[in-house]
Interface confidence: low
């Protein structure tokens, strides 16, 4: 008996071939011997089966001795043995129809779980293997679960159902809702304008929700909400903003925040959360601000940084075009009685300069100038 696998909602064509290459009488029946369709001369006739409105054949092939049964919009319950009767012969074809669905929304938040459920006909024992867009393979029976979805899981999941050495392939499009970056860090000199950007890693027609930026300043004992906003069809509107600092927010995506000035009291870490309409859970992106200040007080030239710096970062003070006078893995360095000239304060990571501030030290009778 020939086995054919079909996909729920798809169309399948079951073949039936006569030895005579001409149009002769045929009919298709199901396992209960109920007629599905057949011919009367050149006319297609349909029987009383439940397939009535979904069954068809190809009259253009009858003259070649081919009498296919086409079943449209397949249902799991169409799984059956179909019998083609032609030339006093019977050809049997077993049709097994499978369905694979994501049992939740196909738009899922990063970190959430995806469950794929296989619908299969009674008596079948299929195995399923799915391949994620990043090439990860998962195997299972009637259900497959993937926990902790990552951004790279967005895209087309290809699932292969295997039964009786035959296979059928399903493609399911999954969107992992997340920010492009989990975390970012901005390095600024004191007084400079700060731009924070929060690009999303997905595109949808309509995006509605609300968000908030909580900020934990390094100098503060607790975090505070800097801004809350609404998102309606990709348009951003500010609901509430603190007076200090007075953040500005772009009206369009990607989410964009401007801090007018980088000041030591603002240095720290923020967490932007975005709650999307009809979704449980929130998207998160961490953002960090490091602020540098170089000052000269009396005979002491000081360079300081505030904010979340890693212990491997190096802070240096050097006279322009000369070797570093002082270089430490600390958040403040200083030089006593600095020579006159242009001094550079450098924050670097493995030789790569992340932040630089220049200060001009005048001969001792003058006051310093900060360019």
């Amino acid at each position: 008996k020939k086995v054919v696998l079909g996909k729920k909602g798809d169309t399948v064509e079951l073949t039936c071939t006569a030895s005579q290459k001409k149009s002769i009488q045929f009919h298709w029946k199901n396992s209960n011997q109920i007629k599905i369709l057949g011919n009367q001369g050149s006319f297609l006739t349909k029987g009383p089966s439940k397939l009535n409105d979904r069954a068809d054949s190809r009259r253009s092939l009858w003259d070649q001795g081919n009498f296919p049964l086409i079943i449209k919009n397949l249902k799991i319950e169409d799984s059956d043995t179909y019998i083609c009767e032609v030339e006093d012969q019977k050809e049997e074809v077993q049709l097994l129809v499978f369905g694979l669905t994501a049992n939740s929304d196909t738009h899922l938040l990063q970190g959430q779980s995806l469950t794929l459920t296989l619908e299969s006909p009674p008596g079948s024992s299929p195995s399923v293997q799915c391949r994620s867009p990043r090439g990860k393979n998962i195997q299972g029976g009637k259900t497959l679960s993937v926990s902790q979805l990552e951004l790279q899981d967005s895209g087309t999941w290809t699932c292969t159902v295997l039964q009786n050495q035959k296979k059928v392939e399903f493609k399911i499009d999954i969107v992992v809702l997340a920010f492009q970056k989990a975390s970012s860090i901005v390095y600024k000199k004191e007084g400079e304008q700060v731009e924070f950007s929060f690009p999303l890693a997905f595109t949808v027609e309509k995006l509605t929700g609300s968000g908030e930026l909580w900020w934990q300043a390094e100098r503060a004992s607790s975090s505070k909400s800097w801004i809350t906003f609404d998102l309606k069809n990709k348009e951003v509107s500010v609901k509430r903003v603190t007076q200090d600092p007075k953040l500005q927010m772009g009206k369009k995506l990607p989410l964009h925040l401007t801090l007018p000035q980088a000041l030591p009291q603002y240095a720290g870490s923020g967490n932007l959360t975005l709650a999307l309409e009809a979704k449980t859970g929130k998207l998160h992106q961490e953002v960090n601000l490091v602020v540098m200040r170089a000052t000269q007080l009396q005979k002491n030239l000081t360079c300081e940084v505030w904010g979340p710096t890693s212990p491997k970062l190096m802070l240096s003070l050097k006279l322009e075009n000369k070797e570093a006078k002082v270089s430490k893995r600390e958040k403040a360095v200083w030089v006593l009685n600095p020579e006159a000239g242009m001094w550079q304060c450098l924050l670097s990571d493995s030789g790569q300069v992340l932040l630089e501030s220049n200060i001009k030290v005048l001969p001792t009778w003058s006051t310093p100038v900060q360019p």
Partner: antibody, heavy 120, light 107 residues
Amino acid sequence: QVQLQESGPGLVKPSETLSLTCTVSGGSISGFYWSWIRQPAGKGLEWIGRIYTSENTNYNPSLKSRVTMSVDTSKNQFSLKLSSVTAADTAVYYCARDREGYYYYGMDVWGQGTTVTVSS
Amino acid sequence: DIQMTQSPSSLSASVGDRVTITCQASQDISNYLNWYQQKPGKAPKLLIYAASNLETGVPSRFSGSGSGTDFTFTISSLQPEDIATYYCQQYDSLPITFGQGTRLEIK
């Protein structure tokens, strides 16, 4: 924006191994598939394969026995090695980024290509 | 492997003409098809993804349609800068395969 630059010897002797490197600048190499494609002079495009991580590669079956791809995230580079080359491997070799996601996919960023000639 | 057959292999048209290129897959590939433009001495450039979606920054005179095995790429009004070779590419299954290309010239 992201830019790709192929590098490697322009001339390789028959039976030797062709080695090319693609350097990614202006963006991270992580989180994307990266493909190699070649094009003999005056001919069409042939996909060689792609890499996501060192453990996750897909090669064209017609070249699989001779191809090795690797990625170095610390240098933002990925590489192609093609062994036992013949004159038929003479082509312009391109590296490209495979963009995958919801309802889209395409090689959206390409290097400018590097010509490799196999000759003794 | 899925074979991709483009036609015609070359065509000549005048500025302002509507130009159509077809691509046929050897099996059903749903809408998993892209179109690329390649100018002489340059790398290919993605124009259309998923059969009918215009890549960001690509002029709207370019369009794509089709599903299953038969696909069409259209330039609604040919411009001099459109002189190039155009390739279709399937990604329904690995290995990724390209059509043989259609060379477009100005009359």
